[in-house]
Structures are given as structure tokens and as C-alpha cells.
């Protein structure tokens, strides 16, 4: 699986979407888990309703919610009041028996809140000659860049790492 990056701003909500083949995964509950280390287990954070027909109902565990559009084939996870410690590698999973098939690997990145003036000196703003009209970004603010780092994904607010 490729890894899809979702960027969110500290203190705000981040929505992660995991598309899947609705017929292939028919009848299966879904889960969101956090990867513990590169080779470690994926620790369950939250799963959809015990009754698959009620998967559309939002279920919370702390500040993380999950809901499943089983007809459209989209699992949506909401991370509320995003914090730096939420950054890391996660998985969307499709369950059957005690098995969990990976639907998508997700890297959550937490950006500093631009309104938090403690970090104001670290903020980066595009110069006049730099245009991002064609970029589709989840948030209109950005973070300080490392040398050679692309400021925004060129085509989408989530991009793939191989």
C-alpha cells in the first residue's frame, strides 16, 4: 500500500477519507488504528458500529470519530482538536472475523496554528512571484519548509509516499 498524507492544523479538526470497493467489502465493519513503529502492531483507536447496517452512525473514542458510507464506499475518520501528538502513521481497516485488511495507510501531519503568535516567526508566506492557483490544499496556511521541500502537494491535498 502507498501512504496517503493528510495535513491538519493544530487545534482544528482533520477529516481523513478512505475510499474502498463497497461490494468487495460488503458486510464488513471498519476500523481506524495507529501503527506502533514500522513493524509493530496497529493499535485499534475506533471501529464502526457493531451492527454493520448501522455503520453510518458516528462512533467516538475520545477525540476521534469514525463513520462509514457503506453504499458509497467511503470510510471517514475525524480527528477533533488535532494535537502534535496525533501526528503519525495510521491505517483504515476492513474487518472480517478477527482479520483486518488494510484499506489505506495514512500519515497524519500536524501543522502549527498560524494564529498562535508563539510560532509567528516560523511561518512561511509565498513571495509575489510564487503562484499556487492550481494547487488543491486542505488548508490555506502552511508551515516552515525544509530546504528543497515542496510547499504544497502539486495536485491534491493528500499525496502518496511510496
Amino acid at each position: 500500500h502507498n501512504t496517503t498524507v493528510f495535513q491538519g492544523v493544530a487545534g482544528q479538526s482533520l477529516q481523513v477519507s478512505c475510499p474502498y470497493d463497497s461490494m468487495k467489502h460488503w458486510g464488513r465493519r471498519k476500523a481506524w488504528c495507529r501503527q506502533l513503529g514500522e513493524k509493530g502492531p496497529c493499535q485499534r483507536v475506533v471501529s464502526t458500529h457493531n451492527l454493520w447496517l448501522l455503520s453510518f452512525l458516528r462512533r467516538w473514542n475520545g477525540s476521534t470519530a469514525i463513520t462509514d458510507d457503506t453504499l458509497g464506499g467511503t470510510l471517514t475518520i475525524t480527528l477533533r482538536n488535532l494535537q502534535p501528538h496525533d501526528a503519525g502513521l495510521y491505517q483504515c481497516q476492513s474487518l472480517h472475523g478477527s482479520e483486518a485488511d488494510t484499506l489505506r495507510k495514512v500519515l497524519v501531519e500536524v501543522l502549527a496554528d498560524p494564529l498562535d503568535h508563539r510560532d509567528a516567526g516560523d511561518l512561511w508566506f509565498p513571495g509575489e512571484s510564487e503562484s499556487f492557483e492550481d494547487a488543491h490544499v486542505e488548508h490555506s496556511i502552511s508551515r516552515s519548509l525544509l530546504e528543497g521541500e515542496i510547499p504544497f502537494p502539486p495536485t491534491s491535498h493528500h499525496h502518496h509516499h511510496h
Partner: antibody
Framework: QVQLQESGPELVKPGASVKISCKAS????????MNWVKQRPGKGLEWIGR????????DYNGKFKGKATLTADKSSNTAYMQLTSLTSEDSAVYFC??????????????WGQGTLVTVSA | DIQMTQTTSCLSASLGDRVTISCRAS??????LSWYQQKPDGTVKLLIY???KLHSGVPSRFSGSGSGTDYSLTIGNLEQEDVATYFC?????????FGGGTRLEIK
């Protein structure tokens, strides 16, 4: 009604390959996982693997990796299993079965009649 | 792999008897257990899924029970047409595995 029609008996030589088929009718073939199970004479049942005809995704029992290859042809509503490098241990009846998910796990609800494969010189 | 053990390979009973066939898993399978019937002509049918749920069209004399690692299939009032081999199967963890089967005969 759902029917799974498997191909006829096969007599094959050791070292050869065989491809058996399972033609489905009475449901949308592309949308259901298909199971394959082995039964040696007078023995129990062994799970070989399953395939999702919609995209060809397959899961195998580690014991049958390299031995069995599962494929599906959506245009003819037919699932196939190819067995290679046959030995006497591969002499068995092979069943296909349509999987349903009930209460969160997969169950083989409809079974084919089985295909007898005999490996003999 | 999870081992499924049916300790009784052959069982003989009289018509009208209540018959119980047992199945043990090598680890907890969370009730993800199915029972199948294979008739002498080789045809296979699903009887019970999720330990105790009767598949549609299966006579009510069949019932299932159990939890954790120990499960059983009961035929309440044995009929001639029940002569068959009965297999349990766990659907909890891949690879899915079957018991060795219990052949049921009429005395």
C-alpha cells in the same frame, strides 16, 4: 437460484498442470468472493484460497501458494483454479463455494458439486 | 494456523435419537464457527453459522452451541436423511480451517 457448476473429472500425469472451472449463475458473480476447498479421499476439508472476481484479488492458504492459482473471468461468470507440478498428494476432489458475510465473517453458503482430480502415471 | 479437532470420527445412533457432535479449536475463535453437512453423494450444505444461527431451509432439529474453543452441533431427533459427515470450520483467522469430520450412521 444460485448454482455453481464445476468442470468434469480430470486424469493427469505427475508433473503436469490442470485447470478446473466453476461456472456461477443466479447471482452477480463479480460482487461475491469465491472460495476453493480441497478434499482428499476419506479425508477432511482444506481451505485453498478465495478470490474476488470484481478485481481478481486473491488470498491463499500459505500451504497452497505456488501450487494453486485462482483467477476469474467476469464475462463468462467463471472462476478457475490452476494446479501445477502435480503429485499424488494433489489427487482430491476440489470444491468451489460462494462466500457470504454473516455476522461479520465469511461463510461458504453455496457449494459446487466438486471436481475429482486424479494424478497417475 | 488454528487447529480444529473433532474427536469422534464416526458416530452410530438410532432414528429419533438426540445426537451431539463436538468440535474444539486450538484457540478462541470468537464464535466464528460454521457447521457443514456432506452427504454420501458428496454434496455439501451449510447448516449453522456463527455458532448457533440456523441457515435458511435447515430443519429446526439442528442446533449449535458453544463459545471460546469448545463448540457442538446437536441433532434433536435423528432422521434417515441425516446420514452424512459433519464438518466444523472456523472463520475467525486466515487460513480458515476445518475439523476432520464426524461420520454419522444409523444403527
Amino acid at each position: 437460484q444460485v448454482q455453481l457448476q464445476e468442470s468434469g473429472p480430470e486424469l493427469v500425469k505427475p508433473g503436469a498442470s490442470v485447470k478446473i472451472s466453476c461456472k456461477a449463475s443466479g447471482y452477480i458473480f463479480s460482487y461475491s468472493w469465491m472460495n476453493w476447498v480441497k478434499q482428499r479421499p476419506g479425508k477432511g476439508l482444506e481451505w485453498i484460497g478465495r478470490i474476488y472476481p470484481g478485481d481478481g484479488d486473491a488470498d491463499y492458504n500459505g500451504k497452497f501458494k505456488g501450487k494453486a492459482t485462482l483467477t476469474a473471468d467476469k464475462s463468462s461468470n467463471t472462476a478457475y483454479m490452476q494446479l501445477t507440478s502435480l503429485t499424488s498428494e494433489d489427487s482430491a476432489v476440489y470444491f468451489c463455494a460462494r462466500l457470504h458475510i454473516y455476522d461479520g465473517y465469511y461463510v461458504s453458503v453455496y457449494w459446487g458439486q466438486g471436481t475429482l482430480v486424479t494424478v497417475s502415471a | 494456523d488454528i487447529q480444529m479437532t473433532q474427536t469422534t470420527s464416526c458416530l452410530s445412533a438410532s432414528l429419533g435419537d438426540r445426537v451431539t457432535i463436538s468440535c474444539r479449536a486450538s484457540q478462541d475463535i470468537n464464535n466464528y464457527l460454521s457447521w457443514y453437512q456432506q452427504k454420501p453423494d458428496g454434496t455439501v450444505k451449510l447448516l449453522i453459522y456463527y455458532t448457533s444461527k440456523l441457515h435458511s431451509g435447515v430443519p429446526s432439529r439442528f442446533s449449535g452451541s458453544g463459545s471460546g474453543t469448545d463448540y457442538s452441533l446437536t441433532i434433536g431427533n435423528l432422521e434417515q436423511e441425516d446420514v452424512a459427515t459433519y464438518f466444523c470450520q472456523q472463520g475467525d483467522t486466515l487460513p480458515w480451517t476445518f475439523g476432520g469430520g464426524t461420520r454419522l450412521e444409523i444403527k
